[in-house]
Amino acid sequence: EPCVEVVPNITYQCMELNFYKIPDNLPFSTKNLDLSFNPLRHLGSYSFFSFPELQVLDLSRCEIQTIEDGAYQSLSHLSTLILTGNPIQSLALGAFSGLSSLQKLVAVETNLASLENFPIGHLKTLKELNVAHNLIQSFKLPEYFSNLTNLEHLDLSSNKIQSIYCTDLRVLHQMPLLNLSLDLSLNPMNFIQPGAFKEIRLHKLTLRNNFDSLNVMKTCIQGLAGLEVHRLVLGEFRNEGNLEKFDKSALEGLCNLTIEEFRLAYLDYYLDDIIDLFNCLTNVSSFSLVSVTIERVKDFSYNFGWQHLELVNCKFGQFPTLKLKSLKRLTFTSNKGGNAFSEVDLPSLEFLDLSRNGLSFKGCCSQSDFGTTSLKYLDLSFNGVITMSSNFLGLEQLEHLDFQHSNLKQMSEFSVFLSLRNLIYLDISHTHTRVAFNGIFNGLSSLEVLKMAGNSFQENFLPDIFTELRNLTFLDLSQCQLEQLSPTAFNSLSSLQVLNMSHNNFFSLDTFPYKCLNSLQVLDYSLNHIMTSKKQELQHFPSSLAFLNLTQNDFACTCEHQSFLQWIKDQRQLLVEVERMECATPSDKQGMPVLSLNITCQMNK
Amino acid sequence: QKQYWVCNSSDASISYTYCDKMQYPISINVNPCIELKRSKGLLHIFYIPRRDLKQLYFNLYITVNTMNLPKRKEVICRGSDDDYSFCRALKGETVNTTISFSFKGIKFSKGKYKCVVEAISGSPEEMLFCLEFVILHQPNSN
C-alpha cells in the first residue's frame, strides 16, 4: 500500500503500512516523513540516505531494537526526530552522528536507563530533549550537557528518579546562560540534597505527583533552596496517587527560592487558609491556581503583590472577594460555584478574562464593577445573563470586548457602547441580541472587528446601524435570520475587507449595497436561499473583491433567470468552491453545477 | 460488527463496538461494574494512541431508547498543566491509567442507552478513536 501524499513532494504519511524497510519510492525532496507503527526493527547506517532534504522524521512505535552507527548520517537538515515507543536495546555510540541541525529529539518510552550512555553530546543545536517515560534512576546530568548550549526543554517526567544530589547539577553551573525548562513530574522523589539547586537558574521547573507524603514534599521543597526559577509549577494529577494531607508547612521552603511566576496545578484537597499557605509567594509577579477547591474566598483581598492572577477550573463557594492593588491581569475562567459576579477592586487592572464561568451580571458595565479605569481587555464570553445597565463609564480605555455566547439583556434600550471610542474588537455573537435600535453601535469610532453572528433584527431587516464604524475591516452578520437590508447599510464602511452574510434568509442578490466598500476582499453569501438577482441588471462588485462565496444557495436554473446565471458565470474568477454551487430548481436540473449549465433560451414572440 | 463486553452489574450490562474504520485496540475495564442507581469505582484504560493526546476532547452522542440527546462536548485536556497525566502522552506512547469515578442520585428509566464517544485530539484536530457504548439498564426491584 502506498504512502499518503499529504503535501506533494514534501510530506508523506506512511503510518501503519506494515513496512519492514524504509520505502524507496518517495521523492528525494521529501521533508516530512511519518513512518510510525511500521515493524522496521533495525536501522542500519545511512538508513535514510535517499532523503537528503528531510526535516521531520517520525519513527514512533516501529519496534526498533537496534540503531547502528550513522543510521541518520546524511540528514544534515533534520530538525525533529521522534523515536517514541521503540524498545531500543542497542544504541551505537555514533547512532545520532550527522544530525548537525537537530533541534528536537523525542526518545519517550525507549527503555533508556541512563543519560550517561545516551550518545547525544555532539548535538550542539538541540533545543528540546524528551526522555520521559523511561527507566532513568539518576538525575546526574552528564558532562556532555555543557555542549548542549541551546537546550531549552528537558523532559524527564515519568522516570525512576528518587534522589537529587549536589553533584547531579554541577554541569549547570558551567552553563549560566541556559534558558532551561525542566520537567521532573511523576518521578518518585524522596530526597533533594540541600544546596543541590543553589545558584542554579531555570526558566521553568515542573514538579507534579513527585511526593507521596506531606513530609517528603516539605523536605524536598526545602532542598530546592537557592534556586532562581522564572516559573515554578507544583501540583498533582487527578488520575495518579494524591497526597492525603496538605497544609501551610508544605510550601514554607519556597521562601528560600527566587520565583517570578508560580502555578499550583490540580490538588485533591480543600484550600482553606490561602494567606498562610502562600505566604512565601506574596511577591511573585504571576500567581496561578488550576483545578483546586478554595474554601475561603475572602483571602484574595490580602495585600498580595501579584501582577497577574490566574484561577482556572477551580471550585469556589461564592465569587471571590478580589481587592489587589498591584494586579494588572486577571484570568478567571471555567470555574464552578459563585454564579453571581460581585464587584472587585483592582485599581491597576488592564486585562480581565471572566469567560466560561456561567456567571450572571446584574448590571454591566462600569468602572465600579471592576474598580479600575485602566481596563483594555474584557472577556465575558460563555457566561449567563448579563444585563446592560451602564455604557462603560470609566472604562473608556477598552480595546477588546467579548460577550459571545452570553445572554445580553437591554442591548437595544440605549447606546451601550457610546463611551468606547478606543474599542478595536467587539464580539457579541450568539448573545440573544435583538437589534431594534439604530444607535446600538454609536461611539465605536475606532472599531475594526465586529462579530455579531447568531443574533436577530427587528423585522429581519438590517438598518443603517454602522454609520459611525468608519474603521471597520471585519464584519460577521451570519446566522442573523436576515431577509433584507437597507441599500445604504454599508455606505460608511470604506475600510471593510471581510463581510460574512452567510446562513441568512436572503432570496435575491443585489450588488448595490456594496458599491461604497472600496476595500472589500471577501464576501460570503453561502447558505442563504438566493435564487436570482434583486434587479434584472446586476452591477459589478467593488474591484477589490477577491473571494465571493455563493455556495449552498437555491439557484433557479431557468430561462427567466438567464441573465443572473450569466452574471454568475462572469464572476467565475471570484467564486470559491464552485462545485458546491448547484441548481435547486427546476427539478430536472436539481443538483447540477450552476457553472456547467448551458442555458439557451429562445424569446417567444 | 464485533461487540466487546465490558462488564455486568446488578442493574446494567455494558458493551461497546468501534464506530471508526481504524479500530485501533483499546482495553477498558470497570471495577466494580457501574450500577446506574449509584456507583463508585475505577476505570482502567490501556491504549496506544495514534496521535498526541494534547487537547483531547470527547464528543458524546447519547441516545435513550431511540431518543437523541443534544451532542455534548467534554474537554479532557486543555493543552497545558492538565488535570490528567495522560494528557501529555505522545503518539505511540503506552497509556496505562486508572481513573476514579463516582455519581449518585440519578434515576434512570429502564431501557437501552447508547453513547457514541468520539475522541478528538491534536492540532490540527483529528479523530483518535470512536466507540459506541451500549448500556442495557434493568432496574432491579428495590
Epitope: K21, Y46, S47, F49, S50 | -
Partner: nanobody, 112 residues
C-alpha cells in the same frame, strides 16, 4: 557481509575531472539505493550523489551540472564522474549503500 571498495581518488587541479568507482561485494546492488557522501575536514558532511534502483538521481545544488552518478548492476559497481572540480570539492568520498553502510573512502584533493 557487505563490502564497498572505492577507487579513483587523487590530486587534481581545479577545473579538471576525476571518475570514482565503487565495487560492492556480498550483495547485489540492483535493488539497493547507492550514492556518494563526502566529508571535508572541519566541515559538515554532505551527500553529493544518489541513485535509486529505478535510475532516478539526486544532486545537491553545490555539484549539480558538474557531477554525474551511474550504476552498472552487472558489474555491481557505482561510478561518480566529477567534472570542473573546485577547491571546495576536496575531501574524503565514501561510497554508500543505504541502510547497509559505507566503504573506507577515497581522498580527493583539488588544488588551485
Amino acid at each position: 557481509e557487505v563490502q564497498l571498495v572505492e577507487s579513483g581518488g587523487g590530486l587534481v587541479q581545479a577545473g579538471e575531472s576525476l571518475r570514482l568507482s565503487c565495487v560492492a561485494s556480498g550483495i547485489s546492488i540492483s535493488t539497493e539505493i547507492m550514492g556518494w557522501y563526502r566529508q571535508a575536514p572541519g566541515k559538515q558532511g554532505e551527500s553529493v550523489a544518489i541513485v535509486k534502483s529505478d535510475g532516478s538521481t539526486y544532486y545537491p545544488d553545490s555539484v549539480k551540472g558538474r557531477f554525474g552518478i551511474s550504476r552498472d548492476n552487472a558489474k555491481n559497481t557505482v561510478y561518480l564522474q566529477m567534472n570542473s572540480l573546485k577547491v571546495e570539492d576536496t575531501g574524503v568520498y565514501y561510497c554508500i549503500m543505504a541502510g547497509r553502510g559505507r566503504g573506507q573512502g577515497t581522498q580527493v584533493t583539488v588544488s588551485s
